[in-house]
């Protein structure tokens, strides 16, 4: 039994950190293999996960952290029974994928203006709290071509924009996603979408 | 909330066991952390004892190793710090507090100290 | 042993003046905190991990650095953010303190 592709990890700087490594062969990933992980830190302690199958020669594994701060370095060994299949670290601080956003909710009740509006993913005390910026995906159901992105480069995790600029009568879905410029993240996965329809008064035109 | 409290005799004689016991109400010293002693003499800087962990492990200064012991008595929620053979020198103010692997370590709830004076 | 040596140790100072201070260390470390104590108090975690806020700590307070040198900076002084300053390591045993800051109104 071999190690085909090395576990590679991200960390969501929060709580869990995700690891992925491919085999050389079929393997059940729960009963053969362990990942044994330990912050390199005078009161750590180790910690064993159990991967998961991920495809048939693919395993991932969800290591469970207390919480993460900028040096923190992770030891991390591979082993199938009693044999070290690989030895590793891991800086959760270089290798960020935040969390995806959440609750997003669309008001339509503003005046022809569309307030659109979604969770922080990050408890108060979390340093990507004050340092996440966003991008809003909103795309008709009607029409593919009618997709467009809104950067949120300020904290307030909201988006204005006016109805007009969509089209009237027909639905729209808005998803959000999130990264952190100061790590260098990866984005978020999408937040799940959100549905509405959207109509507006056209103005009166005079002649 | 979590709260410690120093208490022992503030006066040892020179070359007696100086005996301070800290009592920790607000959370279980056997469920985590590391119970420090830190002792700061007049008009000086702060100084690392030792600690014993939540699991009975316990590391010492080097400098005061041969003289250092420090236990706990879960039953009371209580740990404790004996220095023998004292000097003038270990006349200071001491500090018992929490450290951790939340936060790394850091010292985050302290006792407000006991001053002892070796003296004869 | 990891030494910690603080600069400077005494710093004369006016409300609203931007300060910082210096954290040298004989060997790398990995985990720096700061405390801060005031005369006859017992000292209160202030960053923790570098750059860190303990909790209530205001946000003019802020902490860097890596390696050997690291730095707690205020950014506009307060009349309650006099008092004296320490660093400490948790990369080695022993535990080690910088010899601390003394922050004064000048």
């Known amino acids: 039994m071999k190690v085909l592709q090395e576990p590679t990890c991200v960390s969501d700087y929060m709580s869990i950190s995700t690891c992925e490594w491919k085999m050389n062969g079929p393997t059940n990933c729960s009963t053969e293999l362990r990942l044994l992980y330990q912050l390199v830190f005078l009161l750590s302690e180790a910690h064993t996960c159990i991967p998961e199958n991920n495809g048939g020669a693919g395993c991932v594994c969800h290591l469970l952290m207390d919480d993460v701060v900028s040096a923190d370095n992770y030891t991390l060994d591979l082993w199938a029974g009693q044999q070290l299949l690989w030895k590793g670290s891991f800086k959760p601080s270089e290798h960020v994928k935040p969390r995806a956003p959440g609750n997003l909710t669309v008001h339509t009740n503003v005046s022809d203006t569309l307030l659109l509006t979604w969770s922080n993913p990050y408890p108060p005390d979390n340093y990507l709290y004050n340092h996440l910026t966003y991008a809003v995906n909103i795309w008709s159901e009607n029409d593919p071509a009618d997709f467009r992105i809104y950067n949120v480069t300020y904290l307030e995790p909201s988006l204005r924009i006016a109805a007009s600029t969509l089209k009237s009568g027909i639905s729209y879905r808005a998803r959000v996603r999130a990264w952190a410029q100061c790590y260098n993240t990866t984005w978020s996965e999408w937040s799940p979408s959100t549905k509405w329809h959207n109509s507006y008064r056209e103005p009166f035109e005079q002649h | 909330e979590v709260q410690l409290q120093e208490s022992g005799p503030g006066l040892v004689k020179p070359s007696e066991t100086l005996s301070l016991t800290c009592t920790v109400s607000?959370?279980?010293?056997?469920?985590?952390?590391?119970w420090n002693w830190i002792r700061q003499p007049p008009g000086k800087g702060l100084e690392w004892i030792g600690y014993i962990s939540y699991s009975g492990s316990s590391s010492y200064n080097p400098s005061l190793k041969s003289r250092v012991t420090i236990s706990v008595d879960t039953s009371k929620n209580q740990f404790s710090l004996k220095l023998s053979s004292v000097t003038a020198a270990d006349t200071a103010v001491y500090y018992c507090?929490?450290?951790?692997?939340?936060?790394?370590?850091?010292?985050?709830?302290w006792g407000q100290g006991t001053t002892v004076t070796v003296s004869s | 042993d990891i030494q910690l040596t603080q600069s400077p140790s005494f710093l004369s100072a006016s409300v609203g003046d931007r300060v910082t201070i210096t954290c040298r260390a004989t060997s790398s470390v990995t985990y720096m905190h700061w405390y801060q104590q005031k005369p006859g108090k017992a000292p209160k975690p202030w960053i923790y991990?570098?750059?860190n806020l303990a909790s209530g700590v205001p946000s003019r307070f802020s902490g860097s650095g890596s390696g050997t040198e690291f730095t707690l900076t205020i950014s506009s002084l307060q009349p309650e953010d006099f008092a004296t300053y320490y660093c400490q390591q948790w990369s080695s045993i022993p535990l080690t303190f910088g010899q601390g800051t003394k922050l004064e109104i000048k």
């Open positions: 607000g959370y279980s010293i056997s469920s985590d952390y590391a």
């Open positions: 991990a570098t750059s």
């Open positions: 507090a929490r450290g951790g692997l939340r936060r790394r370590g850091l010292f985050d709830y």
